[in-house]
């Protein structure tokens, strides 16, 4: 079931999925000057059986000016390398992607793909947060968020993470003010809705990371 909202916003933090649950969709978006090939896939879809998950369909971009030229899907080595530098570093990764049943790894880039990826998560997806460069983490609990479904409505759990500037006088974790979910859904609206937030990963946050070459949107 698709998550119909977005992981919470934590100031000065960004998040990433380390693996993608079966059912996750990735938009086949092309960079400026390129478009999806005619009859090309709209999405890549994480599918699988009990033993193996992989991305169905391949995204293919062609020059908007050219009619028949189909660009290769296989990334050039330098493109692959460039893209990898933007991913969160391995110490952040709590599980080995390959060992997580029912999940797909990060799909490799395709030639002339857009500068940001738009994912559509499903219920049960987990994302992990880390502070952007220049900020450090104060934890009161897991720095992760999970998409859950309650009474047919989807919501993301609130990660227990505060990012503080290195120059600031830091509080002890126990002394922090509770982190409110911005634009949260008021629980009074209906008894079975739990507070959540509608958030798209902020490109300005990602842009503060020195290594950031592309951003990812999660829908």
């Amino acid at each position: 079931e698709l998550c119909d909202d977005d992981p919470p916003e934590i100031p000065h933090a960004t998040f990433k999925a380390m693996a993608y649950k079966e059912g996750t969709m990735l938009n086949c978006e092309c960079k400026r000057g390129f478009r999806r090939i005619k009859s090309g896939s709209l999405y890549m879809l994480c599918t699988g059986n009990s033993s193996h998950s992989s991305w169905d369909n391949q995204c293919q971009c062609t020059s908007s000016a050219t009619r028949n030229t189909t660009k290769q899907v296989t990334p050039q080595p330098e493109e692959q390398k460039e893209r990898k530098t933007t991913e969160m570093q391995s110490p952040m990764q709590p599980v080995d992607q390959a060992s997580l049943p029912g999940h797909c790894r990060e799909p490799p880039p395709w030639e002339n793909e857009a500068t940001e990826r738009i994912y559509h998560f499903v219920v049960g997806q987990m994302v992990y947060y880390q502070c952007v460069q220049g900020y450090r983490a104060l934890h009161r609990g897991p720095a992760e968020s999970v998409c859950k479904m309650t009474h047919g409505k989807t919501r993301w759990t609130q990660p227990q993470l505060i990012c503080t500037g290195e120059m600031e006088t830091s509080q002890f974790p126990g002394e922090e003010k509770p982190q409110a979910s911005p634009e949260g859904r008021p629980e009074s609206e209906t008894s079975c809705l739990v507070t959540t937030t509608d958030f798209q990963i902020q490109t300005e946050m990602a842009a503060t990371m020195e290594t950031s070459i592309f951003t990812t949107e999660y829908q």
Partner: antibody, heavy 116, light 106 residues
Framework: QVQLVQSGAEVKKPGSSVKVSCKAS????????MHWVRQAPGQGLEWIGY????????EYNQKFKDKATITADESTNTAYMELSSLRSEDTAVYYC?????????WGQGTLVTVSS | DIQMTQSPSTLSASVGDRVTITCSAS?????MHWYQQKPGKAPKLLIY???NLASGVPARFSGSGSGTEFTLTISSLQPDDFATYYC?????????FGQGTKVEVK
């Protein structure tokens, strides 16, 4: 209480455009996606797409990609859907529906009639 | 796209009858949702996540199924139940609905 109130019925000429509005109240507008659904006369329901009001991100059913443009105005808690290059087959009732999972609240519908 | 096929398209029944509507998805989905629509009105959420009744929905309605085959059952049809029923999947984009089943008076 949650309410979605849509603009009134429209009669349009082929080739023209129409903009349908959906004013939300009773909840935090930016916290839920707003979806749009079409129902042609005597037909079933077809999902057109959604908007995330906070950032303006849209996702469309490919069938309506060149037909519908969904926008939102946070200041007035209103979502809009513009239909362009109208043809007789665009005659339908258009509904907005609050997202966040199943569609628990719907607008009353806006009938758009395309006739020469 | 996931196609949703409802059967029957029209169902003639009487008050007190047990009514069953089926919905088949062209691919496996996680859940099915059901809406009820009356003429000139917007659809109303009836059942969510396959078997859960929406707020205010009478217990005579029930839903079941998994994978590609799902069922909506009305145990004892009441006058207020004559309407059109739609199944709906939101497991993958584009979101899709069944073509509808009209429950009419026999």
């Amino acid at each position: 209480q949650v309410q979605l109130v849509q603009s009134g019925a429209e009669v349009k000429k082929p080739g023209s455009s129409v903009k349908v509005s959906c004013k939300a109240s009773g909840y935090t507008f930016t916290s839920y996606r707003m979806h749009w659904v079409r129902q042609a006369p005597g037909q079933g329901l077809e999902w057109i797409g959604y908007i995330r009001p906070k950032r303006g991100y849209t996702e469309y059913n490919q069938k309506f990609k060149d037909k519908a443009t969904i926008t939102a105005d946070e200041s007035t808690n209103t979502a809009y859907m513009e239909l362009s290059s109208l043809r007789s087959e665009d005659t339908a009732v258009y509904y907005c529906a609050r997202g966040g999972g199943v569609f628990d609240y719907w607008g009353q519908g806006t009938l758009v009639t395309v006739s020469s | 796209d996931i196609q949703m096929t409802q059967s029957p398209s029209t169902l003639s029944a009487s008050v007190g009858d047990r009514v069953t509507i089926t919905c088949s998805a062209s691919s496996s989905i996680s859940y099915m949702h059901w809406y009820q629509q009356k003429p000139g009105k917007a659809p109303k959420l009836l059942i969510y996540t396959t078997s859960n009744l929406a707020s205010g929905v009478p217990a005579r309605f029930s839903g079941s199924g998994s994978g590609t085959e799902f069922t909506l059952t009305i145990s004892s049809l009441q006058p207020d139940d004559f309407a059109t029923y739609y199944c709906h999947q939101r497991s993958t984009y584009p979101l899709t609905f069944g073509q509808g089943t009209k429950v009419e008076v026999k």
